[in-house]
Interface confidence: low
């Protein structure tokens, strides 16, 4: 096929249309002008080319734009985006949210690929921070996106963007990530009233310190056990039995089912058995009556 480099008579493409899916690879290479392809990229996605044909089209664009594609081409890549390597994408300068959405749409339903991860990274770095619109878009396509970021990366999320976060977006976040996100959420929702505030802040409470949990216990919030089990152990340990009872409200009965699991198990070990007995749940493992409880952390602070 090496000698078949000239375009056969009458086969020169005048426009990008359906007839091209019947071209052999070498005919596409010889008969489709790269500049024509670049100006009519929006049509490529409407034509069911085979992947082998898409490889040829990509090769033509690569030759035309060795330094990276312009955004006008990138926005209309469609299925051709799936042919791009992370190395290709690193050459791009994507600034438009519409371009990002168009490319994420192509990958919709598939797991986040290295290409998509690189694209998002390029886009966010170009913007300087994860603004609300970007976060809205990314979490709509990839609910786990936020939890895939490092604590350092999360630090660039402005508090205003937290409004875009849904509870399921935080499902896979670990405590280190919630430690970064919680203060931002607290700031974002600070002007809401008690019950509304709790609904919004609830998903972020895995990063809350003891003093904030104590404050919540005074507000009749009725925290569910699932949320309680995600709290930081070190934040739960200093809470008194009375504070936990107020914090959980009617859900306090659920402690019995969780008494062998953290943070409930560790919290029980720190409480006086007398106090635990007041709950009437049969929780065992508290400090027996007559024992002196030394708060070692306080002792260390004084020495």
């Amino acid at each position: 096929e090496v000698e078949k480099t000239a375009c056969p008579s009458g086969k020169k493409a005048r426009e990008i249309d359906e007839s091209l899916i019947f071209y052999k690879k070498w005919e596409l290479e010889a008969c489709v002008d790269a500049a024509l392809l670049a100006t009519q990229m929006d049509r490529v996605n409407a034509i069911p080319f085979t992947y082998e044909q898409l490889d040829v089209l990509k090769h033509k664009l690569d030759e035309l734009y060795p330094q990276g594609y312009p955004e006008s081409v990138i926005q209309h890549l469609g299925y051709l985006f799936l042919k791009m390597s992370p190395e290709d994408i690193r050459k791009w300068n994507v600034t438009s949210l519409e371009t990002l959405k168009a490319l994420l749409e192509v990958n919709k339903g598939h797991e986040m690929s290295p290409q998509v991860a690189t694209l998002i990274d390029r886009f966010v770095k170009g913007r300087g921070q994860l603004d609300k619109d970007t976060l809205d878009t990314l979490t709509a396509f990839y609910p786990g996106y936020l939890c895939s970021l490092s604590p350092e990366e999360l630090s660039s999320v402005p508090p205003s963007s937290i409004w875009a976060v849904r509870p399921q977006d935080l499902d896979t976040c670990d405590p280190r990530q919630l430690d970064v996100l919680y203060p931002k959420a607290r700031l974002a929702f600070q002007n809401m009233n008690g019950s509304e505030y709790f609904v919004k802040i609830q998903s972020f409470l895995g990063g809350a310190p003891t003093e904030d949990l104590k404050a919540l216990s005074q507000q009749n919030v009725s925290m569910d056990l699932a949320t309680f089990m995600k709290l930081r152990t070190d934040a739960v340990l200093p809470l008194t039995v009375a504070e936990v009872q107020k914090l959980l409200g009617p859900h306090v009965e659920g402690l019995k089912a969780e008494e062998r699991h953290r943070p409930v198990r560790d919290w029980i070990l720190r409480q006086r058995q007398d106090d635990l007995d007041t709950l009437g749940l049969g929780l065992q493992g508290g400090i027996p009556n007559g024992y002196l409880v030394l708060d070692l952390s306080m002792q260390e602070a004084l020495s």
Epitope: A46, P48, T50, Y51, Y79, L82, H110, S113
Partner: nanobody, 116 residues
Framework: QVQLVESGGGLVQAGGSLRLSCAFS????????MSWYRQAPGKQRTVVAS???????SYADSVRGRFTISGENGKNTVYLQMNSLKLEDTAVYYC??????????WGQGTQVTVSS
């Protein structure tokens, strides 16, 4: 093991109809693009019709208006309704499934013979 199995081929008189089916199994995903190709004796395999996962279709000029490709991607089957068959439609018809990041999968083919 991904398998594409074609059926529905056979001997038919010119002007008659056939409906080819392609069922794929052994995969939990759906294909981005399903196509029917054909290969006549001594000729290259060429694409006849294609359907994308969102329902876009495309046809070779020689079959447009006579053949209809359809499919329910979620049900893992694609069809080729062939009407007004001509002698030159005689060929082995192959099903092709393609998905991004995954190689293309071919079926074994089903023979269609149009007689006068």
């Amino acid at each position: 093991q991904v398998q594409l199995v074609e059926s529905g081929g056979g001997l038919v008189q010119a002007g008659g109809s056939l409906r080819l089916s392609c069922a794929f199994s052994g995969t939990t995903y759906t294909f981005d693009l399903m196509s029917w190709y054909r290969q006549a004796p001594g000729k290259q395999r060429t694409v006849v019709a294609s359907i994308s996962s969102d329902g876009r279709t495309s046809y070779a000029d020689s079959v447009r208006g006579r053949f209809t490709i359809s499919g329910e991607n979620g049900k893992n089957t694609v069809y080729l309704q062939m009407n007004s068959l001509k002698l030159e439609d005689t060929a082995v018809y192959y099903c092709l499934g393609q998905r991004s990041g995954v190689r293309a999968f071919w079926g074994q083919g089903t023979q269609v013979t149009v007689s006068s």
